[in-house]
């Protein structure tokens, strides 16, 4: 399960982005039918996202961000104004709405931070790429929620449990997108900030940062270690490659339903392998 992120090939948002469509699981409802108020809200937001992409596709690159934001803003505002239940009950109509509102807020803030300071053309790409991925994560969590009644849901995932790793995949993509748009000297800082924000957003605040997920923290540390003694201009690339491989390994471990300890071991081994490959590719420097 390769993460499919290619920093050298920027995405073309107008044509390529497919925002999440949170179809409920087959046993919960007919495909594509939202079953909860929260799913209805995210469906409306996704519809607005698509409409905004279409609007932005028809304008000059320098005007894309402004056009997207204006169109998506009206749609998002309308989605919140209409529901949940069409009542003006503020940010915390219910505990589930409060959680969704916080996730969406974090997603919008992250997209804005990612795009901040970029040229108008790059701003659009960064904002849409980040928001697209964040909406996909949020919609994914709502699909899971549709399977069980809210009362049966585990509110906070205990640290070390593997089901959070699927969200790490997406958080990594968001952070990598942000970092690759940043100046060379800021890439690590931007990556770490965006990675933490995305993890926090996708887990509804259950995890404040990657450091709260032991397996992931170990992987990040090893990925950083892989960059020691590498040339400055490739340090970030080495780090990203190593961490990407580690997260891929974690995902595979999760699919195979291995325990957390095994996943950590797999991730550690993967980082080691990636380190070897990366250092070989950059002139054989090794710690």
């Amino acid at each position: 399960a390769d993460l499919g992120y290619g920093p050298a090939t920027p995405a073309a948002p107008a044509a390529g982005y497919t925002p999440a469509t949170p179809a409920a699981p087959a046993e919960a409802a007919p495909a594509g039918k939202a079953t909860t108020e929260e799913q209805k809200l995210i469906e409306k937001i996704n519809a607005g996202f698509k409409a905004a992409l279409a609007a932005a596709a028809g304008v000059q690159p320098a005007d894309k961000y402004r056009t997207f934001v204006a169109t998506f803003g009206a749609a998002s505002n309308k989605a919140f104004a209409e529901g949940l239940s069409g009542e003006p009950k503020g940010a915390a109509e219910s505990s589930s709405k409060a959680a969704l509102t916080s996730k969406l807020d974090a997603a919008y803030k992250l997209a804005y931070k990612t795009a901040e300071g970029a040229t108008p053309e790059a701003k659009y790409d960064a904002y849409v790429a980040t928001l697209s991925e964040a909406l996909r994560i949020i919609a994914g969590t709502l699909e899971v929620h549709a399977v069980k009644p809210a009362a049966e849901e585990v509110k906070v995932i205990p640290a070390g449990e593997l089901q959070v790793i699927e969200k790490v995949d997406a958080a990594f993509k968001v952070a990598a997108t942000a970092a690759n748009a940043a100046p060379a000297n800021d890439k690590f800082t931007v990556f770490e900030a965006a990675f933490n924000d995305a993890i926090k957003a996708s887990t509804g605040g259950a995890y404040e940062s990657y450091k709260f997920i032991p397996a992931l923290e170990a992987a990040v540390k090893q990925a950083y270690a892989a960059t020691v003694a590498t040339a400055p201009e490739v340090k970030y690339t080495v780090f990203e490659t190593a961490l990407k491989k580690a997260i891929t390994a974690m995902s595979e471990a999760q699919k195979a339903a291995k325990p957390a300890a095994a996943a950590t071991a797999t991730a550690t081994a993967a980082v080691g392998a990636a380190t070897g490959a990366a250092t070989a590719a950059t002139g054989g420097y090794k710690v």
Partner: antibody
Framework: ESGGGVVQPGRSLRLSCAAS????????IYWVRQAPGKGLEWVAM????????HYADSVKGRFTIFRDNSNKTVHLQMNNLRSEDSGVYYC?????????????????WGQGTMVTVSS | ELTQSPSSVSASVGDRVTITCRAS??????LAWYQQKPGKAPKLLIY???SLQSGVPSRFSGSGSGTDFSLTISSLQPEDSATYYC?????????FGQGTKVEIK
């Protein structure tokens, strides 16, 4: 806003609020009032499609809010006015979202119209 | 219910001024701050407790979550003379604090 003025207790007034330069039919609109020398108090709200209208307890049964999205206007019909209804009435746009995050605030206000209820 | 303190404050140009707003129950970060000058409509300064509204000078900042919030003017300017209101958006109806009047000495 327009429609304010001096009126005797028990009489009626109709306030209007005309909007421009934004997607009017995507926003909830509120009337907020301010008695002389006092703080801000919400009076009434209307949803984007008129399906939901809410009123402060102090005006329930006396005030009616309605909107005309095609003309980008919101109206507040005030009947059976009382002296305590006196003050400046503002229409305000309730915004849930901007590109930096959730907003949940009144981000656009009219200039206000004065209502004086006095015998 | 929202309680602002102090009800009024007098400070000199360049001073740091802090206004607090306390909610009777937790409202997460869904609090906004407004500035109102005499004879004018309120103006949104801060939303979501700490986000600066577009066009508002950076000397204004907001912080807090749960029940305790504050608005800080880092270096008071003559044009900041006004009444400041907090407003909660956690649950309807959206209520305002009673206001804090800021005067220039």
């Amino acid at each position: 806003e327009s429609g304010g003025g001096v009126v005797q207790p028990g009489r009626s007034l109709r306030l209007s609020c005309a909007a421009s330069e934004f997607a009017f039919d995507s926003y909830e609109i509120y009337w907020v009032r301010q008695a002389p020398g006092k703080g801000l108090e919400w009076v009434a709200m209307i949803s984007i499609d008129e399906t939901n209208k809410h009123y402060a307890d102090s005006v329930k049964g006396r005030f009616t809010i309605f909107r005309d999205n095609s003309n980008k206007t919101v109206h507040l019909q005030m009947n059976n006015l009382r002296s305590e209804d006196s003050g400046v009435y503002y229409c305000a746009r309730w915004n849930n979202w901007n590109h930096r995050g959730m907003v949940f605030a009144f981000d656009l206000w009219g200039q206000g119209t004065m209502v004086t209820v006095s015998s | 219910e929202l309680t602002q303190s102090p009800s009024s404050v007098s400070a000199s140009v360049g001073d740091r001024v802090t206004i607090t707003c306390r909610a009777s129950q937790g409202i997460s970060s869904w609090l906004a701050w407004y500035q109102q000058k005499p004879g004018k409509a309120p103006k949104l300064l801060i939303y979501s407790a700490s986000s600066l509204q577009s066009g508002v000078p950076s000397r204004f900042s907001g912080s807090g979550s749960g029940t305790d919030f504050s608005l800080t003017i880092s270096s008071l300017q003559p044009e900041d003379s006004a009444t400041y209101y907090c407003q909660q958006a956690n649950s309807f109806p959206y209520t305002f604090g009673q206001g804090t009047k800021v005067e220039i000495k």
